[in-house]
Interface confidence: medium
């Protein structure tokens, strides 16, 4: 098979957007399977047409409606003949157009009067490509060969820059880059104390506008009264916009405020936010818990707990917790140091304990009292009582924060 590209020069140059028809003539084969190849890859589309001129003469067409830069390359056609592939002479297709930008000026944020650079690059074909720079509507540099770097000594207000690329086919304009001025950040807002304990406070806030410069850190200032002596100042890297304040005094009034800084300096402070740390839970367990059995039930008594210091605040009600080995358990809150227990089974052993609470929580549990289901002769108790006394093993004055109906898993209640 004699195979040649008909009517096409070895180099074909077209303008961008123009139609192109490559044709390939095959002679000496009755039914050629003509394939078009571009840069080594078979062209897998239907923009192709095969026309029989005569029994042994075919023309294949590859049709491009509107040539683009991506269509440029080396084309040839090929046919299979007796297991061998025959290849035509190639055509180099060049698509010319106005310059195409490969690098365009980018938006920047710079400090006032600080020097900066902008880059621009464009390519043909046709080459050469020259670059002209614009600042707003004023031409400021060029023509210079592509690529081009514009050095600017500084700006004092937001300014627009663009570049223009020229070649024999015409000119193309780049995107417009805006060079913004950096500024100090705005004050943070929504400053919130998210968690409070007796000695710690968690703080969160929303950053204000960053002044077009990355926020680097925020400072949390703590005083014991707005405008009072600074107790604490914590500098935290951001994000996240949170801070944990440690080692605060319990039951104390504080105020805090926050500011954030970028490379240019700090923002104004946000408004003061007052908060109060929680007091301490009671430190002591009620002492001398004992029981008096009566005909109508069981009376429990214990000694009053006196606050160990002002940080415990006023001590509130007592919390009484009891359980029986049949699984019955309950809890009651009483104001005084005496409680009347009902609803328990006198046939089963009863274990009782008590703690005193305040606004923070319950103090440590008292030593557990076991009330036996039968009398033990010779036990000393108040007159007319039918009370059994048992000294508990492994007595405990540990501080356990009370969780409803979960206290019975503590070791002092286990065998």
């Amino acid at each position: 098979a004699g195979l040649k590209l008909m009517g096409a020069p070895v180099k074909l140059t077209v303008s961008q957007g123009q139609p192109v028809k490559l044709n390939c003539s095959v002679e000496g084969m009755e039914e050629p399977d003509i394939q078009w190849v571009k840069d080594g890859a078979v062209v897998q589309n239907l923009d192709q047409l095969y026309i029989p001129v005569s029994e042994q003469h075919w023309i294949g067409f590859l049709s491009l409606k509107s040539a683009e830069r991506s269509d440029a390359g080396r084309y040839w056609c090929q046919v299979e003949d007796g297991g061998e592939t025959e290849i035509s002479q190639p055509v180099w297709l060049t698509v010319e157009g106005v310059p195409f930008f490969t690098v365009e000026p980018k938006d920047l944020a710079v400090p006032p009067n600080a020097p900066f650079q902008l880059s621009c690059e464009a390519v043909g074909p046709p080459e050469p490509v020259t670059i002209v720079w614009w600042r707003g509507t004023t031409k400021i540099g060029g023509p210079a060969p592509s690529p081009s770097v514009l050095n600017v000594t500084g700006v004092t207000q937001s300014t627009m820059f663009s570049c223009e690329a020229h070649n024999l086919k015409g000119l193309a304009s780049s995107r417009t880059a805006t060079v913004h001025l950096q500024a100090l950040p705005a004050a943070p807002f929504n400053v919130t104390v998210t968690k409070l304990s007796s000695s710690n406070a968690s703080v969160a806030w929303m950053p204000g506008a960053d002044g077009r410069a990355l926020l680097q850190s925020c400072t949390v200032q703590v005083t014991q009264a707005p405008g009072g002596w600074e107790v604490l100042a914590v500098v935290v890297p951001v994000p996240p916009f949170t801070c944990l304040l440690r080692d605060l005094v319990p039951a104390t009034n504080y105020s805090l405020r926050v500011r954030c800084a970028n490379a240019l300096g700090p923002s104004p402070y946000a408004d003061w936010v007052p908060f109060q740390t929680k007091g301490l839970a009671p430190a002591s367990a009620p002492q001398n818990l004992h029981a008096i059995r009566t005909d109508s039930g069981l009376i429990l008594e214990w000694e009053e707990v006196i606050p160990e210091g002002p940080l415990e605040g006023p001590l509130g009600p007592y919390k009484l917790s009891w359980v029986q080995d049949n699984g019955t358990q309950d809890e009651l809150t009483v104001e005084g140091t005496r409680a009347n227990l009902t609803g328990w089974d006198p046939q089963k052993d009863l274990i009782v304990r008590v703690c005193v609470s305040n606004a923070v929580g319950c103090g440590p549990w008292s030593q557990p009292l076991v009330v036996s289901s039968h009398d033990h002769a010779g036990q000393q108790g108040p007159p007319h009582s039918r009370t059994s006394w048992l000294v508990p093993r492994g007595s405990s004055a540990h501080h356990h924060h009370h969780h409803h109906h979960s206290a019975w898993s503590h070791p002092q209640f286990e065998k």
Partner: antibody
């Protein structure tokens, strides 16, 4: 004279299989592509796919890939459109179309097409 | 999948100019073809490669393409031009053809 003769109208039940044909004459069958085009009652034209008589190479439209099979028999110059399992939505007129071009002695192709008369396929229970 | 969009209907008086549009994202790179289908008949190729008239088609039929829009123009429409017109083009990938939804031309 180029002629495309299509098989006659057919009525089938859903789930049935069917093959319709398009026999070409008046030209060298292997030189050209044949397309199948569907037209549902009162609706527009839909390109289903095409086959080149020479190498039986096929192309399908996305909506028809896997639903129909296009084939050709060079010895009888016939193109076929086949369904394994018909659905009521397959009720339509089916045209076969021969695509062609000539160079009029030059190297600029002139297009022409020949359409078959169509085969009406009705799928109804 | 790729779509070509046409107006459902266009009406003109005899002798007026009718314009039928077809829009598709690939039309800047792919040629448009136009078919005429009269009631109960098979379609006929009217225009190929955007603007080339098929043999035997009257000169009043012309085609053009700009950007993503192809247009079929009938200058001095006749009553016999009343038909459905379909645009037809390659998908953006170039490996399957697509018809537009069709435009019913009424010549009142």
């Amino acid at each position: 004279e180029v002629q495309l003769v299509q098989s006659g109208a057919d009525v089938k039940k859903p789930g049935a299989s069917l093959t319709i044909s398009c026999q070409a004459s008046g030209y060298t069958f292997t030189d050209y592509w044949i397309s199948w085009v569907r037209q549902k009652p009162g609706k527009g034209l839909e390109w289903m796919g095409q086959i080149r008589g020479q190498h039986s190479s096929t192309l399908y439209g996305p909506s028809f890939q896997g639903h129909v099979t296009i084939s050709a028999d060079r010895s009888t110059a016939t193109a076929y459109l086949q369904w394994r399992s018909l659905e009521a939505s397959d009720t339509a007129m089916y045209y076969c179309v021969r695509h062609g071009a000539s160079t009029s002695g030059g190297t600029i192709p002139e297009y022409y097409q020949h359409w078959g008369p169509g085969t009406l396929v009705t799928v109804s229970s | 999948s790729y779509e070509l969009t046409q107006p459902p209907s266009v009406s003109v008086s005899p002798g007026q100019t009718a314009r039928i549009t077809c829009s598709g994202d690939a039309l800047p790179k792919k040629y448009a073809y136009w078919y005429q289908q009269k009631s109960g008949q098979a379609p006929v190729l009217v225009i190929y490669e955007d603007a080339k008239r098929s043999s035997g088609i009257p000169e009043r039929f012309s085609g053009s393409s700009s950007g993503t829009m192809a247009t079929l123009t009938i200058s001095g429409a006749q009553v016999e031009d009343e038909a459905d017109y379909y645009c037809y083009s390659l998908s953006d990938s170039g490996n399957y053809f697509v018809f537009g939804g069709g435009t019913k031309l009424t010549v009142l």
